[in-house]
């Protein structure tokens, strides 16, 4: 099982604490759970009409 | 794949019960939160409840605690919905959905990404 | 509880303009909001969450942003499948509420 937060002190003060790796503290569920990895694309060419919206590395299934 | 795959709806009276299942298959409901999301007719998009399997944690919607209970069983990689004391009110199409979390400097940032496709409660005399 | 107050309730546009749609949060959520498209029949699609980041897989037309209360979702080239209703979710603390919803009509 996973390790949740040390304390948890009612659903307005959540405690965000240290996750295991691949793991990080949701504020909605007050938790560990597992996590991908946000990443930023590669800029557009120059002459690009906007910056590249941002992404995620999807979790591991 | 990914696919939640909700069962359980129908029609039942004001008072009665029913137990709602959103089977998952694709990934371990463990290692995510999932979450109940219910749309009246012609309506908006309401939260029930969610439940973190791994944990066993819960949380309700006021309009709904005490008369709901939401569970899971990680063997069969699949979440409930014990509907008690239905009223009139709950009469919904209920989605299941997965809450998929990335790591923004140890907080998730996310949002639900899988849904099931709905099974309709008609709560009615 | 956090309001999720969107805004317009509907809007008419035709295929190729620029679509804005707003949320205003009750109090500050910080990033922590998501937009959602759902077809007459369908469970809705995730499109953006933390307030800017687009979801795998949805087009780069689609776009969101702010933060704290002010919360924008932009689309920059209306497209026929793009006429759905839009809505805005925070995540921040249970329970995660919803706007109440945005009809993109055709015009």
């Known amino acids: 099982m996973r390790r949740g937060p040390r304390s948890l002190r009612g659903r307005d003060a959540p405690a965000p604490t240290p996750c295991v790796p691949a793991e990080c503290f949701d504020l909605l569920v007050r938790h560990c759970v597992a996590c991908g990895l946000l990443r930023t694309p590669r800029p557009k060419p120059a002459g690009a009409s906007s910056p590249a919206p941002r992404t995620a590395l999807q979790p591991q299934e | 794949e990914v696919q939640l795959v909700e069962s359980g709806g129908g029609l039942v009276q004001p008072g009665g019960s029913l137990r709602l299942s959103c089977a998952a298959s694709?990934?371990?409901?463990?290692?995510?939160?999932i979450h109940w999301v219910r749309q009246a007719p012609g309506k908006g998009l309401e939260w029930v409840a969610w439940v973190t399997p791994g944990v066993g944690s819960t949380d309700y919607a006021d309009s709904v605690k005490g008369r709901f209970t939401i569970s899971a069983d990680t063997s069969k990689n699949t979440a409930y919905l014990q509907m008690n004391s239905l009223r009139a009110e709950d009469t919904a199409v209920y989605y299941c959905?997965?809450?998929?979390?990335?790591?923004?400097?140890?907080?998730?940032?996310?949002?639900?990404?899988?849904w099931g496709q709905g099974t309709l409660v008609t709560v009615s005399s | 509880d956090i309001q999720m107050t969107q805004s317009p309730s509907s809007l008419s546009a035709s295929v190729g303009d620029r679509v804005t749609i707003t949320c205003r949060a009750s109090q500050d959520v910080s990033t922590a909001v998501a937009w959602y498209q759902q077809k007459p029949g369908k469970a809705p699609k995730l499109l953006i969450y933390s307030a800017s980041f687009l979801y795998s897989g949805v087009p780069s037309r689609f776009s969101g942003s702010g933060s704290g209360t002010d919360f924008t979702l932009t689309i920059s080239s209306l497209q026929p499948e793009d006429f759905a209703t839009y809505y805005c979710q925070q995540s921040l603390m249970t329970p995660p509420t919803f706007g109440q919803g945005t009809k993109v009509e055709i015009k």
């Open positions: 694709g990934f371990t409901i463990s290692s995510n939160s």
């Open positions: 959905a997965r809450r998929v979390c990335y790591n923004r400097l140890g907080v998730c940032a996310g949002g639900m990404d899988y």
